[in-house]
């Protein structure tokens, strides 16, 4: 082992490249980020340069563990790729490229219910659509606060359908919708829609 | 040969300035983390601060506001400069790069700083 | 911010005698530790990194142990080149102010 190695003298096993990962890969724009640039070998003394195509944007030292750069993401341009460079003396090496997704968020939907009323049942149509926010995205319909549907993906701008039928019901009951794209831990809901207890001319929307 | 010489020692009044010099030979300083380490006579080494491999500075408590330390890639040196000093800051001054695991293995002689009036 | 402490500042052996010699950080340092010789008027010399390898060309004679905040340098048959100061070097995993300091070293003289 000497005091002072170069390059030649470290083996690619010893020194492979780095790994530049991020919790996050689906991000909005304004979003503050993380991104992990880590090495296999825990012992050496590595310098990491973090760079978005040619751009430095920054350098940390650590030893056994991953530097920690915190980005925000606020233009297109910015969502990559990013390299990540590992740096021991002389010898460096570059991770993969990195690239976050940019989705723009889903505004709040508008649920719209259309009921046929029959002397025992009705039979009800929720329609549930999102009018902002990047495709796809999944809609999920609630009735008093417990999922009715499965996730349902629409690919494009058009309101997301759902049919259930129901004997006429004693008491109220309360609808609204879920919109989710991309973007984890972001969902956004309907306002409620109250169903009355009752048919005739207190259903505002029964076609009889 | 792959060596370490510092210099810029000597005899320096209490308040006045001295710049420490770290040559290499042998060797390129330029991708290696430096630090400085002091030892006042009969007492323990005391480690001054480190220069990066990217010109970032760290120091001891005691040696921030007082103590820089640069490098000049070209000349392939690292330097300590030292104001307002005091007769405690009388030391054997020691360069040494961290070596890939970030242990300073490779040491100069050390210069000597006398501060007395 | 931390601190080195080191013990005993001082020892006194005999060739032949196993030496014990332990640094304690004020806080953990997982196994960035390093012990070094120094003998009068020289550099300090590495002995040990990462708390417990060896560096080359040191006698096996040399080991240590220890992770965290406690570690321990041992000499296993004291040789007479062996009287010297020894001193432990601890530091954090990542370039810091104060992220960096030496024990106040333990002296082994001739019992």
């Known amino acids: 082992r000497k005091a002072v190695l170069d390059c030649e003298a470290m083996k690619t096993n010893e020194f492979p490249s780095p790994c530049l990962d991020s919790k996050t890969k689906v991000v909005m724009k304004g979003q503050n980020v993380s991104m992990f640039c880590s090495h296999k070998n825990k012992s050496l003394q590595i310098t990491y340069s973090l760079f978005r195509r040619k751009t430095h944007l920054g350098t940390q030292d650590g030893k056994g563990e991953p530097a920690i750069f915190n980005l925000s993401i606020t233009e297109a341009h910015e969502s990559g790729p990013y390299k990540c460079k590992a740096q021991v003396t002389s010898c460096s090496k570059y991770s993969r490229d990195f690239s976050f997704t940019i989705v723009d968020p889903v505004t709040s939907p508008v649920l719209n219910i259309m009921v046929i009323q029959t002397e025992t049942d009705r039979h009800i149509t929720l329609h549930c659509l999102s009018v902002n926010g990047s495709l796809p995205i999944n809609y999920t319909f609630f009735e008093n606060h417990v999922a009715i549907s499965p996730a349902i993906s629409k690919y494009d701008r058009e309101p997301a359908e759902f049919n259930l039928t129901k004997k006429n019901p004693g008491e109220e009951e309360e609808y609204r919708c879920e919109a989710k794209n991309r973007l984890p831990n972001y969902a956004t809901y309907s306002h409620p829609v109250t169903m009355p207890s009752t048919g005739g001319d207190s259903c505002p929307f029964c076609l009889k | 040969e792959v060596q370490l010489v510092e210099s810029g020692g000597g005899l320096v009044q209490p308040g006045g300035s001295l710049r420490l010099s770290c040559a290499a030979s042998g060797f390129s300083l330029n991708n290696y983390f430096m630090i400085w380490v002091r030892q006042a006579p009969g007492k323990c080494l005391e480690w001054i601060g480190i220069i990066t491999s990217y010109h970032t500075t760290y120091f001891a408590n005691w040696a921030k506001g007082r103590f820089t330390i640069s490098r000049d890639n070209s000349k392939n040196t690292v330097y300590l400069q030292m104001n307002s000093l005091r007769a405690e800051d009388t030391a054997v001054y020691y360069c040494?790069?961290?070596?890939?695991?970030?242990?300073?293995?490779?040491w100069g002689q050390g210069t000597l700083v006398t501060v007395s009036s | 911010d931390i601190q080195m402490t080191q013990s005993p500042s001082s020892l006194s052996a005999s060739v032949g005698d196993r030496v014990t010699i332990t640094c304690q950080a004020s806080q953990s340092i997982g196994a960035y530790l390093s012990w070094y010789q120094q003998k009068p008027g020289k550099a300090p010399k590495l002995l040990i990194y990462?708390?417990?390898t060896l560096a080359s060309g040191v006698p096996s004679r040399f080991s240590g142990s220890g992770s965290g905040t406690d570690f321990t340098l041992t000499i296993s048959s004291l040789q007479p080149e062996d009287f010297a100061t020894y001193y432990c070097l601890g530091a954090y995993g990542r370039s810091s102010d104060d992220g960096t300091a030496f024990g106040c070293g333990t002296k082994v003289t001739v019992l």
């Open positions: 040494a790069p961290y070596d890939i695991y970030g242990y300073p293995t490779l």
């Open positions: 990462e708390a417990s």
